[in-house]
Each structure stands twice: as C-alpha cells, then as structure tokens.
C-alpha cells in the first residue's frame, strides 16, 4: 500500500550539535527499514546527508541529525523518503526551533540558616551562545502528597536555587527536577532533568517551645 505521513516532521535543535525531527505515519511503520530523512544545509557546496530514523512508537519516527555548531543563518532542506517516493519536503532553521539540552547533575545540599541549596550544571560550554541565555524552572514536589508542589523560576545567571526548609513540610520526602529555556531564542522548554530526592528534616520553630 501507499505510505503516508499523518503528522509532518517537527524539528528542534539543541543549538550545539544535534537536531531532532519527529513525525507520525498513518499506520505502524518500521521507521529504520522503510524511511530515510535527507538533510542538506542551504550553503554553497554542501553535501546531502541521510538520517536513519528510529521508532518512538508504532507509527512515530524520530531522527537525530548531527549538525555543526549552529549559527542563525543556517537553513536545512529536509526530504522524507520511502524508497524512491518523496513523502514530504520542507525547510528547517535551527535557530528558530531551539530546544535546549537538559540541565545535568542536579544535587541538593543542606545550607546555612535552614536552607537547602539546589545546584545543577548548565548543559552548554561557555563559548556556546546558549550558555548565557538559559533560564530555568525548578519543580519541587512532595513524594507522598501530589497537592504539595512548588515551581520556582530561576531567571538569574547561576544554576542554583536556595530553598527555605520552612517552606516544605517537616519530615517529608521531596523530589526536585529542573528544565531550561532560552528566552532570546524563543525556545521550547528542555526535557526535565532526572529527579533528585531528599528528606526535609527541618524542625518548625514552634516545636522548640
């Protein structure tokens, strides 16, 4: 039967080394066996490159394309093929479709004055444009109470958040995760980092009386 694309490719770039495109076929498809995504930078002399997609679900395909350190002017021509049949053709400008890398190494440390210090790493090297552009969202949730969660926006440069222990329930186990976005690039949010868990052993002042 004929091969058709149900949802055309949607692509995002981490703006350093990789662009990822995802699309949905109209029926379950062995993406790596049946499809190829070709991509070529719109730049004099550029070669055509081929990405072999993988299955994310039965009919969802995903392709990870290694790209050079992106610059604003870069535009790629994309062509989705099923053998000799061109299923879809489009262009993709990485600088206009940024999804930052996931922040790493989230840790929680007890700090002075009954505070917790949450720290994570900026996923970009200092020389990359995005290094100084990231802001973060930290989600802190009670492992045993879905209603007890807080969201913190970290808009300053350092990848840290100080959290007063008194704002959390004493004796409860909490998990935190962090994600990033780049405002000047109008990016989407990165994926959430893996969670880190700790016990909030802060003793309310009233219990001392």
């Amino acid at each position: 039967g004929s091969v058709k694309v149900l949802h055309e490719p949607s692509c995002f770039s981490d703006y350093i080394s990789t662009s990822v495109c995802q699309w949905k076929m109209d029926h379950p498809t062995n993406c790596s066996a049946e499809l190829r995504l070709s991509y070529q930078l719109d730049f004099m002399g550029s070669e055509n490159h081929t990405c072999v997609p993988e299955n994310r679900e039965d009919s969802v395909c995903v392709c990870s394309m290694p790209i050079d350190d992106a610059v604003e002017a870069d535009v790629y021509q994309l062509d989705l093929w099923a053998g000799q049949q061109l299923l879809w053709s489009g262009s993709f400008q990485p600088s206009k479709h940024v999804k930052p890398r996931t922040p790493g190494n989230l840790t929680v440390h007890p700090n002075i004055s009954h505070t917790w210090l949450l720290m994570w790493t900026n996923p970009y090297p200092t020389e990359n444009h995005l290094h100084s552009e990231l802001t973060y969202m930290v989600n802190v949730s009670n492992d045993n109470d879905p209603e007890d969660f807080k969201v913190y926006n970290v808009t300053y440069m350092g990848p840290t958040l100080r959290l007063a222990a008194s704002t959390l329930k004493s004796g409860a186990s909490y998990s935190a995760r962090v994600r990033a976005w780049a405002q000047t690039y109008n990016s989407t949010w990165s994926d959430w980092s893996p969670s880190t868990t700790w016990l909030n052993y802060y003793e309310p002042w009233e219990q001392h009386l």
Partner: antibody, heavy 125, light 112 residues
Framework: EVQLVESGGDLVKPGGSLRLSCVAS????????MTWVRQAPGKGLQWVSL????????YYADAVKGRFTISRDNAKNTLYLQMNSLRAEDTAVYYC??????????????????WGQGTLVTVSS | DIVMTQTPLSLSVSPGETASISCRSS???????????LDWYLQKPGQSPQGLIY???KRASGVPDRFSGSGSGTDFTLRISRVEANDTGVYYC?????????FGQGTKLEIK
Amino acid sequence: EVQLVESGGDLVKPGGSLRLSCVASGFTFRDYAMTWVRQAPGKGLQWVSLINGSGGKTYYADAVKGRFTISRDNAKNTLYLQMNSLRAEDTAVYYCAVDRKTKTIRPQYYGLWVWGQGTLVTVSS
Amino acid sequence: DIVMTQTPLSLSVSPGETASISCRSSQSLLYSIGYNYLDWYLQKPGQSPQGLIYLGSKRASGVPDRFSGSGSGTDFTLRISRVEANDTGVYYCMQGLQSPLSFGQGTKLEIK
C-alpha cells in the same frame, strides 16, 4: 605536495566542443569542492563553475549555464569541464582550483587555496 | 548576484611603504560572527593566482604577516606593509558566499 594539473586546452571553432581535465594530487580529493575560473587575455578573473566533493551539487556562471558541464571522478582524482557550443568570448586561460571542504555539514572554507597552472582555450574560426 | 568593486584599479608604492586596497560588495558577506566570505588573491605576472587571505582576515598558509585583511559585511581592506619588489602583480578580491562566485576587477600594484 598539493598539485593540480590541467589539460585539454586547444584551438577550436565557434560552436565546437572541448573537454578540460584537472588531475589532483597531495590531498583527499573527494573531501573538497572544486572550481573552474577563467581569464580572458588581458582581463580579470571570472568564476565559471563549482562542484561539491561528492559531485552531487553543481553551480554555474550565467555566461556558461546550459553549455558547460562540470563533473568529477573521485576514483581518478580528476575534475572535468565539458564545454559545448563554444563562442569567441569563451577564449581564456582556464584554471582549476581547490575550494571548500564539503565533507563536514557546513563546508569549511579556506578560499581557493590551490590553483593549477592553467590551460588555454582559444575559440576562433 | 553579488557585485564586487575594487579601488583603486592601480597603485604605485615605494618599497617599504604600506599599500591599501579596498573591496566593496553589493551584499553583506557576513554569514555568521567572524565568518566573512571574502578572499584576496595575488596574480604575479605570468603566473596563476595564489591565495593570500580567506574569510576576510585569515592568512593562507605560507603568506607573510605583512599581508593583512580586515573589514566586515560589505567593506574590506587588504593592507600590505613594508612593500617589496616581489609584491608586484594584480590583486583580486572574491566573494565565496553564494553562487555565482564573483571577483573584483583587480588592482594592479606597481613598485616604484
């Protein structure tokens, strides 16, 4: 040592055809785009055509489009320029030159970093 | 198409002096920060052209540091300091950004 040697230049009548060759050595030929540039007697340099490393993409000056064809044989480290429907104004020394490295996603640019010695094409009746 | 305009078309300089050649493009040659696709070439009498400067300011291999390129966008300059008799020839700028590639008309440098 990186070297380019052109051949094939000759005296040809208007409307005639000629094929120029450029044999490369001393570098990984398939990794680089190649360019032809010409120079009419007593005139400046004029770009003619470019082909990327794989041979999959070609570019031409308007003055030669539809008449000239650039190609390459990476197994033989050789660049070609097939010239048809030649005109008097095509009379020039034709140089081949090594252009950008196209093996990477975004071509790495070093300018036209090596040139051949040139071959003379004369179109006259 | 991008048009390249060089000035002056001829230049006469005494040995040891500095020669400056200007090149202007009809469109910006800046692709990304630090990447101006503008080259300079020298063609000595009876020889093939040779690369001097690429990407606006990077010296080609083996080119003496007396040769320097500067500029960005549409305005570029080649400077040759401490000019020597061996520097005589025709200097060309070329844009390598987009097809069709294009050269300036050339500047003939004569050493007095």
